[in-house]
Amino acid sequence: CDLPQTHSLRNRRALILLAQMGRISPFSCLKDRHEFRFPEEEFDGHQFQKTQAISVLHEMIQQTFNLFSTEDSSAAWEQSLLEKFSTELYQQLNDLEACVIQEVGVEETPLMNEDFILAVRKYFQRITLYLMEKKYSPCAWEVVRAEIMRSFSFSTNLKKGLRRKD
């Protein structure tokens, strides 16, 4: 399971697509900045085993996929870029799922990191709530796009875990 390299390449492609998706100048959106509290400290203070890292990354990508698969998201972004981005995320999810099966066997998917998965879910709930409060405005989506790019690059500790042997 050569996940570190494939995940890194797909992650980079997804980030490039996300960067290209911007429709309005972010300079007009400064006042819409918001504190989403990505659980950075929790991740940084933990040495993830490979199976743990896979399941937390899976949750992050799944939540991102869900966020950008809504009707409101379709209205906000250029359709062909959004489709490419979603496809890239879907491929990442498939890679991670295949790796979990290969690493621990389908029945043994680790349940030891519910706290981290819950932290990721709450983080995405805050993002969804913000978008609702801002009525899915173009600036709100710009802020969310910037935040997702940041959280993708923040998950370096998780990616280190992908290189570990359990």
Epitope: A19, G22, S25, P26, F27, C29, L30, K31, D32, R33, H34, E35, F36, E142, V143, A146, E147, M149, R150, S153
Partner: antibody, heavy 121, light 107 residues
Framework: EVQLVQSGAEVKKPGESLKISCKGS????????IGWVRQMPGKGLEWMGI????????AYSPSFQGQVTISADKSISTAYLQWSSLKASDTAMYYC??????????????WGQGTLVTVSS | DIQMTQSPSSLSASVGDRVTITCRAS??????LNWYQQKPGKAPKLLIY???SLQSGVPSRFSGSGSGTDFTLTISSLQPEDFATYYC?????????FGQGTKVEIK
């Protein structure tokens, strides 16, 4: 270690052109905006403008719009501030600083050492 | 443009004193305010961001408060290295604007 390193001091004559630089290292250059700040001798800080190096989108203070041009070359992690025709009143220290863009993070957390521009006939 | 007004423009204080600098915005900027310290011949240094968050590596004697239009920077016990000029800056909207500065001098 995050660093912004600016080009050296310049002495120019009125009417001459100039381009000063700010090279970023130790972080993802395209993940942050780069702002430029002027400080005239013995005076306070004035924000001039900002660039998003990922796509070279810019925003200027109305006081500096049309007076200067901000650009960037992301392939070499460098932002630029340029004048096509300098005036004596452009004599100042110019600083670059990084900005987190739309992210909830500290503004202007790292600064360049400054470039002193002197314009005199 | 949002105008930022600092007061006082200068003050004299002794080591150990509690020092307070205020900054007023011409319109509400929520909590989008930063404080910087600048020493002669040096680049500014970020102290406080988003009105009250202490920047990493900055001593805890520095604190910030306020929201809307009125903000305060407090130095609880002035140290010799704190004699400098302090600037507030709004990061609510473009154009970004700074206060005119407050020079803290030795009494």
């Amino acid at each position: 270690e995050v660093q912004l390193v600016q080009s050296g001091a310049e002495v120019k004559k009125p009417g001459e052109s100039l381009k000063i630089s700010c090279k970023g290292s130790g972080y993802s250059f395209t993940s942050y905006w780069i702002g430029w700040v002027r400080q005239m001798p013995g005076k306070g800080l004035e924000w001039m403008g900002i660039i998003d190096p990922s796509d070279s989108d810019t925003a200027y203070s109305p006081s500096f719009q049309g007076q200067v041009t901000i650009s960037a070359d992301k392939s070499i992690s460098t932002a630029y501030l340029q004048w096509s025709s300098l005036k004596a009143s452009d004599t100042a220290m110019y600083y670059c600083a990084r900005h987190p863009g739309l992210n909830w993070a500290p503004d202007f957390d790292y600064w360049g050492q400054g470039t002193l521009v002197t314009v005199s006939s | 443009d949002i105008q930022m007004t600092q007061s006082p423009s200068s003050l004299s204080a002794s080591v150990g004193d509690r020092v307070t600098i205020t900054c007023r915005a011409s319109q509400s900027i929520d909590g989008a305010l930063n404080w910087y310290q600048q020493k002669p011949g040096k680049a500014p240094k970020l102290l406080i961001y988003f009105a009250s968050s202490l920047q990493s590596g900055v001593p805890s004697r520095f604190s910030g408060s306020g929201s809307g239009t009125d903000f305060t920077l407090t130095i609880s016990s002035l140290q010799p290295e704190d004699f400098a000029t302090y600037y507030c800056q709004q990061s609510f909207d473009f154009p970004l604007t700074f206060g005119q500065g407050t020079k803290v001098e030795i009494k």
